[in-house]
């Protein structure tokens, strides 16, 4: 009878597995090939994180991950002779990295950042429970277009929250927004446990408010034309147009996904301008319009942060009360 294929020989474990941190939140594991691997073996390395996440089989003797170092993270690595996931790898070797030491109750909480109009990032946090009220905080940040880690200079206070803002301008490089900003907050005296965050540049984007350029009536329709905030193209934004009528005391809100200026009533070919027609508006009454915008999922991961409202603009006549 024809016997099955001979069982694959298990490879020896990898050697010299080590771990280091680059920038603020880039964790890199490196290792050496196993000693005494069989000569007819084309070495591949199987690796996964401690919770069996992100399995990977690759020929490189390194693996990196961008992760906020707020908790311990471990990588297990083994060697094998093929890319076949069903092949049993060598004994797995594990190497872990722990967050910086310190009382967890001293670490800041709610560390969050918002990228304002793709021009500056504003981060805020709450002090840790177990800290002195006069703690002086420092925020460090890094992203790919920076050569080194930078310290944020503009620390401020908003109520119970501390914050810091730094310039971050969208680079024309098409891959810029596929990256993240790495953030760390600690205190000057080194008494608190540092806190980390990673802010993807496709999320937490808050545009500036739009600017209403023109309101005009055509029959019983109100034509609204506005300028979008700088740095955004109109197809990447959603809009909310609010119209308040002083006579009827109605308050209409229109959620606008596309705001093209295709109607002949609109001024044409004005760059970065959007338009919307509000139907059934009484021209002989006072109508007040304001608009806000937010990023949409066509261009961004996040669509939750509305801009502030634009300045109001009014059209029509206020009727005399009799």
């Amino acid at each position: 009878g024809g016997g099955g294929a001979a069982p694959t020989e298990t490879q020896p474990p990898v050697t010299n597995l080590s771990v280091s941190v680059e920038n603020l939140c880039t964790v890199i594991w490196t290792w050496n090939p196993p000693e005494g691997a069989s000569s007819n073996c084309s070495l591949w390395y199987f690796s996964h994180f401690g919770d069996k996440q992100d399995k990977k089989i690759a020929p490189e003797t390194r693996r990196s991950i961008e992760v906020p170092l707020n908790e311990r993270i471990c990588l297990q690595v083994g060697s094998q002779c093929s890319t076949n996931e069903s092949e049993k790898p060598s004994i797995l070797v594990e190497k872990c990295i722990s967050p910086p030491e310190g009382d967890p109750e001293s670490a800041v909480t709610e560390l969050q950042c918002i990228w304002h109009n793709l021009s500056y990032m504003k981060c805020s946090w709450l002090p840790g429970r177990n800290t002195s009220p006069d703690t002086n905080y420092t925020l460090y940040y890094w992203h790919r277009s920076l050569e080194k880690i930078h310290q944020c200079e503009n620390i401020f206070r908003e109520g119970q929250y501390f914050g810091c803002s730094f310039d971050l301008t969208k680079v024309k490089d098409s891959s810029f927004e596929q990256h993240s900003v790495q953030i760390m907050v600690k205190d000057n005296a080194g008494k608190i446990k540092p806190s980390f965050n990673i802010v993807p540049l496709t999320s937490r984007v808050k545009p500036d408010p739009p600017h209403i350029k023109n309101l005009s009536f055509h029959n019983d329709d109100l034509y609204v034309q506005w300028e979008n905030p700088q740095n955004f193209i109109s197809r990447c934004l959603f809009y909310e147009v609010e119209v308040n009528n002083s006579q009827t005391e109605t308050h209409n809100v229109f959620y606008v996904q596309e705001a093209k200026c295709e109607n002949p009533e609109f001024e044409r070919n004005v760059e970065n301008t959007s338009c919307f027609m509000v139907p059934g508006v009484l021209p002989d009454t006072l109508n007040t319009v304001r608009i806000r915008v937010k990023t949409n999922k066509l261009c961004y991961e996040d669509d939750k942060l509305w801009s502030n409202w634009s300045q109001e603009m009014s059209i029509g006549k206020k009727r005399n009360s009799t």
């Epitope: 109750e105 909480t109 709610e110 969050q112 709450l126 002090p127 429970r129 177990n130 800290t131 002195s132 009220p133 908003e158 109520g159 119970q160 929250y161």
Partner: antibody
Framework: EVQVLESGGGLVQPGGSLRLSCAAS????????LTWVRQAPGKGLEWVST????????YYADSVKGRFTISRDNSKNTVYLQMNSLRAEDTAVYYC???????????WGRGTLVTVSS | EIVLTQSPDFQSVTPKEKVTITCRAS??????LHWYQQKPDQSPKLLIK???QSFSGVPSRFSGSGSGTDFTLTINSLEAEDAAAYYC?????????FGQGTKLEIK
């Protein structure tokens, strides 16, 4: 003037529910945590629950965990305390307090009385 | 949880007298201790924050001291309007806790 004002108290049977509201004014609402503290008749103060300014951090006393839910609507400058499965020992005046700095209460409301009785 | 024990529970004093109320924490809380005054049928009011810092608008006769586990609220030259319950409160760790209160009565 900075102030907080509680409402929604009343008489409820054991096992019943009640929702308290705390309306705030005079400060930038989403920059401050708000806390519910209660005081049973003739007794001392007992911390109940806290919600941070942005609403990401929420804490409860063990005595109410799983029964009470704190929430906030920053567009309405209001914090809520949803109280379910009420017991006689929940009878108290419920105060809403604004937190400042490292977690002290600088502004208190007048309180709203919750009575749990059959 | 951190237990705060106040003493005395009750004190009857005459105007102009100096009053001392102590608050002891079951473990060290640094300076995260605050004092409140509650007059009958009123809500509490903040007197002292961070163990020794007077809150704005509070009369200068009220002062606080201490750190770690032992804290003191002192009222120099008591006035009739100071008849109230006084509570200490720790914010060093959750759950927040209050002392059981000290009731001051004016003779």
């Amino acid at each position: 003037e900075v102030q907080v004002l509680e409402s929604g108290g009343g008489l409820v049977q054991p096992g019943g529910s009640l929702r308290l509201s705390c309306a705030a004014s005079g400060f930038t609402f989403n920059n401050y945590a708000l806390t519910w503290v209660r005081q049973a008749p003739g007794k001392g103060l007992e911390w109940v629950s806290t919600i941070s300014g942005r609403g990401y951090s929420i804490y409860y006393a063990d005595s109410v965990k799983g029964r009470f839910t704190i929430s906030r609507d920053n567009s309405k400058n209001t914090v809520y305390l949803q109280m379910n499965s009420l017991r006689a020992e929940d009878t108290a005046v419920y105060y809403c307090a604004k937190e400042e700095g490292h977690w002290f209460f600088d502004v208190w409301g007048r309180g709203t009385l919750v009575t749990v009785s059959s | 949880e951190i237990v705060l024990t106040q003493s005395p529970d009750f004190q009857s004093v005459t105007p102009k007298e100096k009053v001392t109320i102590t608050c002891r924490a079951s473990q060290s809380i640094g300076s995260s201790l605050h004092w409140y005054q509650q007059k009958p049928d009123q809500s509490p009011k903040l007197l002292i924050k961070y163990a020794s810092q007077s809150f704005s608008g509070v009369p200068s006769r009220f002062s606080g001291s201490g750190s770690g586990t032992d804290f003191t609220l002192t009222i120099n030259s008591l006035e009739a309007e100071d008849a109230a319950a006084y509570y200490c409160h720790q914010s060093s760790s959750l759950p927040y806790t209050f002392g059981q209160g000290t009731k001051l009565e004016i003779k």
